[in-house]
């Protein structure tokens, strides 16, 4: 058993049918010695008396808010949560496996640049009685500071019969140098509590590996005289690290017909312009990627050919 | 890949070209190592990230772009700062800093070259003959060093009398390649920046 926060405790259980569970001793936080009784949640049934209460915690029915009273007055509370260990592996019931970039990916994180700011998000089908708390650091043995905000519900989607909820959090490394070569990964730890179930999820990454630039901005077409060709030009996104000559991007320019079946023409360039043939009803899209370290491509920025 | 739009300084341009070749070569070598050594811990998540140049060179600091010298987090391990009375830099100081930066890159390359050659000698003794260093990568290191055109005393190749532990050697190869790729990215950024300046 360990303390998650004041008056909230997590009991770790080896979870299998007929498991013996864990013996837990609760102590009433009071100078009083006599006339103390204990109850669980809203029930008025007295579970025991005395300054300490010993319970065998086996299942969720044994978890909850234990309260000690004296003469109708509440003295203190202890909330017991359960953390299930199933055959040596901590349960992952609360969050959905996003399966990207690999199986067992519960937390996904992205950064728009090298400033040390990043966003993580996760999915769940649970809509109520759900709380998250996020901590982060650079390295684990001698951790350096990363400050995270509160997790917020960022999107709701309908997936088949189920509703899916996306939560996200923004974090910022306290003293980040965009040019630094990372040798210690960023660690992100999410505590999830659903009703009386506790779970924790972690992700470990280097900022360089989670970079996904914003799409190029100011995408414009300039027709070339007496030609079906157009000059496409664009700019680096505002959110990208500066100077751009140091933090360079490379670009992919795509000409896509109206029909998804039509052949796509693609050009790769390090410049911020390109000359392409603009077909009728086609659209031109441009996306960006770090020129020197191949992390994710940005989303496409698009303009119609007409 | 197309080269940046800025008209390259004829002195810098060969270095930019060689640094791009270097990054391509080390990335290919790392990919090959990850595939060949699939039963070894060779992914970024599995290895310890060690920098053999730590405390010996200071490439990131010496080559920091002017624009980042205002960022205190970038300066905490710098002995020499670009900032002089808040005014523009004197060209002598700029060229001094650039020389410091390029010599630091040269020293990095020299250290990695020695490590890779020592390691290759060990790998050639492996009866499994599982992996060797790409000669192209070693050649590209050499080319960039020549283009940088610094003279410094040659570091003797390390020789070891004891029987090599091939498992440890292959894991060390992965660690070295990961670190060298990261340094190659920095070198490429620096060359691109200097080329545009």
């Amino acid at each position: 058993i360990w303390e998650l926060k004041k008056d909230v405790y997590v009991v770790e259980l080896d979870w299998y049918p007929d498991a013996p569970g864990e013996m837990v001793v609760l102590t009433c936080d009071t100078p009083e010695e006599d006339g103390i009784t204990w109850t669980l949640d809203q029930s008025s049934e007295v579970l025991g008396s005395g300054k300490t209460l010993t319970i065998q915690v086996k299942e969720f029915g044994d978890a909850g808010q234990y309260t000690c009273h004296k003469g109708g007055e509440v003295l203190s509370h202890s909330l017991l949560l359960l953390h299930k260990k199933e055959d040596g592996i901590w349960s992952t019931d609360i969050l959905k496996d996003q399966k990207e970039p690999k199986n067992k990916t519960f937390l996904r994180c992205e950064a728009k640049n090298y400033s040390g700011r990043f966003t993580c998000w996760w999915l769940t089908t649970i809509s109520t009685d759900l709380t998250f708390s996020v901590k982060s650091s650079r390295g684990s043995s001698d951790p350096q500071g990363v400050t995270c905000g509160a997790a917020t519900l960022s999107a709701e989607r309908v997936r088949g019969d189920n509703k899916e909820y996306e939560y996200s959090v923004e974090c910022q490394e306290d003293s980040a140098c965009p040019a630094a070569e990372e040798s210690l990964p960023i660690e992100v730890m999410v505590d999830a509590v659903h009703k009386l179930k506790y779970e924790n999820y972690t992700s470990s990454f280097f900022i360089r590996d989670i970079i996904k630039p914003d799409p190029p901005k100011n995408l414009q077409l300039k027709p070339l005289k007496n030609s079906r060709q157009v000059e496409v030009s664009w700019e680096y996104p505002d959110t990208w690290s500066t100077p751009h000559s140091y933090f360079s991007l490379t670009f992919c320019v795509q000409v896509q017909g109206k029909s998804k079946r039509e052949k796509k023409d693609r050009v790769f360039t390090d410049k911020t312009s390109a000359t392409v043939i603009c077909r009728k009803n086609a659209s031109i899209s441009v996306r960006a990627q770090d020129r020197y370290y191949s992390s994710s491509w940005s989303e496409w920025a698009s303009v119609p050919c007409s | 890949r197309n080269l940046p739009v800025a008209t390259p300084d004829p002195g810098m341009f060969p270095c930019l070209h060689h640094s791009q070749n270097l990054l391509r070569a080390v990335s290919n070598m790392l990919q090959k190592a990850r595939q060949t050594l699939e039963f070894y811990p060779c992914t970024s998540e599995e290895i310890d990230h060690e920098d053999i140049t730590k405390d010996k060179t200071s490439t990131v600091e010496a080559c920091l772009p002017l624009e980042l010298t205002k960022n205190e987090s970038c300066l905490n391990s710098r002995e020499t700062s670009f900032i002089t009375n808040g005014s523009c830099l004197a060209s002598r100081k700029t060229s001094f800093m650039m020389a410091l930066c390029l010599s630091s890159i040269y020293e990095d390359l020299k250290m990695y070259q020695v490590e890779f050659k020592t390691m290759n000698a060990k790998l050639l003794m492996d009866p499994k003959r599982q992996i060797f260093l790409d000669q192209n990568m070693l050649a590209v290191i050499d080319e960039l060093m020549q283009a940088l055109n610094f003279n410094s005393e040659t570091v003797p190749q390390k020789s070891s009398l004891e029987e090599p532990d091939f498992y440890k050697t292959k894991i060390k190869l992965c660690i070295l390649l990961h670190a060298f790729r990261i340094r190659a990215v920095t070198i490429d950024r620096v060359m691109s920046y200097l080329n545009a300046s």
Epitope: D14, W15, Y16, P17, D18, A19, E59, F60, K85, E86, D87, G88, I89, D93, K102, N103, K104, T125 | F39, P41, E46
Partner: antibody, heavy 115, light 112 residues
Framework: QVQLVQSGGGVVQPGRSLRLSCAAS????????MHWVRQAPGKGLEWVAF????????YYADSVKGRFTISRDNSKNTLYLQMKSLRAEDTAVYYC????????WGQGTMVTVSS | SYVLTQPPSVSGTPGQRVTISCSGG????????VKWYQQLPGTAPKLLIY???QRPSGVPDRFSGSKSGTSASLAITGVQAEDEADYYC????????????FGTGTKVTVLG
């Protein structure tokens, strides 16, 4: 004490269907994940499928994906394996089993796919 | 498609020490715990060892398990006639959990 009693096995022709059941008692069935494991005659153990305690997630071996469906009825304390498009290579003893460091197995039920 | 490899058979005379190996990889045994099962002819498997080296109550102490790196082993010290059975190791793969990964199985024969 924990008990898993299986039923539903038998002889079936290739291409036909069969449903296996596994009735649980002696524990809170709705709190635990459950597996199906099979063993072809004279061969080793092969995992078939898993279902979460609440039925929210199901996982299948590639060899049965799209043909077999694992399900549970927590109000009836019963686990099921619906097997469709059966093939000769599905001939095996099928076991249900609880998920956890200490597990309990059903007695097994024989499924023979033969024309 | 077994990823955990066991020797097909091992044998010993009563009282001898018999060991069975189970070889896997970094993503399974290297990252997860190992169980061992005993299966007597015509019966369901019986758990002998869980969490690499833990014995459930009721399992004789002549059975012991261990794990090192990407392989595990089961030892029977002082093998007895009633130990003649098939033995299976089991683990998970970190990418496919909760799918059970079973070893190829080992037939233990007690001679004499």
């Amino acid at each position: 004490q924990v008990q898993l009693v299986q039923s539903g096995g038998g002889v079936v022709q290739p291409g036909r269907s069969l449903r296996l059941s596994c009735a649980a008692s002696g524990f809170t069935f709705s709190s635990y994940g459950m597996h199906w494991v099979r063993q072809a005659p004279g061969k080793g153990l092969e995992w078939v499928a898993f279902i979460r305690y609440d039925g929210s997630n199901k996982y299948y071996a590639d060899s049965v994906k799209g043909r077999f469906t694992i399900s549970r009825d927590n109000s009836k304390n019963t686990l099921y394996l619906q097997m469709k498009s059966l093939r000769a290579e599905d001939t095996a003893v099928y076991y249900c089993k609880t998920h956890g460091s200490h597990d309990n197995w059903g007695q097994g039920t024989m499924v023979t796919v033969s024309s | 498609s077994y990823v955990l490899t066991q020797p097909p058979s091992v044998s010993g005379t009563p009282g001898q020490r018999v060991t069975i190996s189970c070889s896997g990889g970094r993503s399974n045994i290297g990252s997860n715990t190992v169980k061992w099962y005993q299966q007597l002819p015509g019966t369901a498997p019986k758990l002998l060892i869980y969490a690499n080296d833990q014995r459930p109550s009721g399992v004789p102490d002549r059975f012991s398990g261990s794990k090192s790196g990407t392989s595990a082993s089961l030892a029977i010290t002082g093998v007895q006639a009633e130990d003649e059975a098939d033995y299976y190791c089991q683990s998970y793969d970190r990418g496919t959990h909760p799918a059970l990964l079973f070893g190829t199985g080992t037939k233990v024969t007690v001679l004499g």
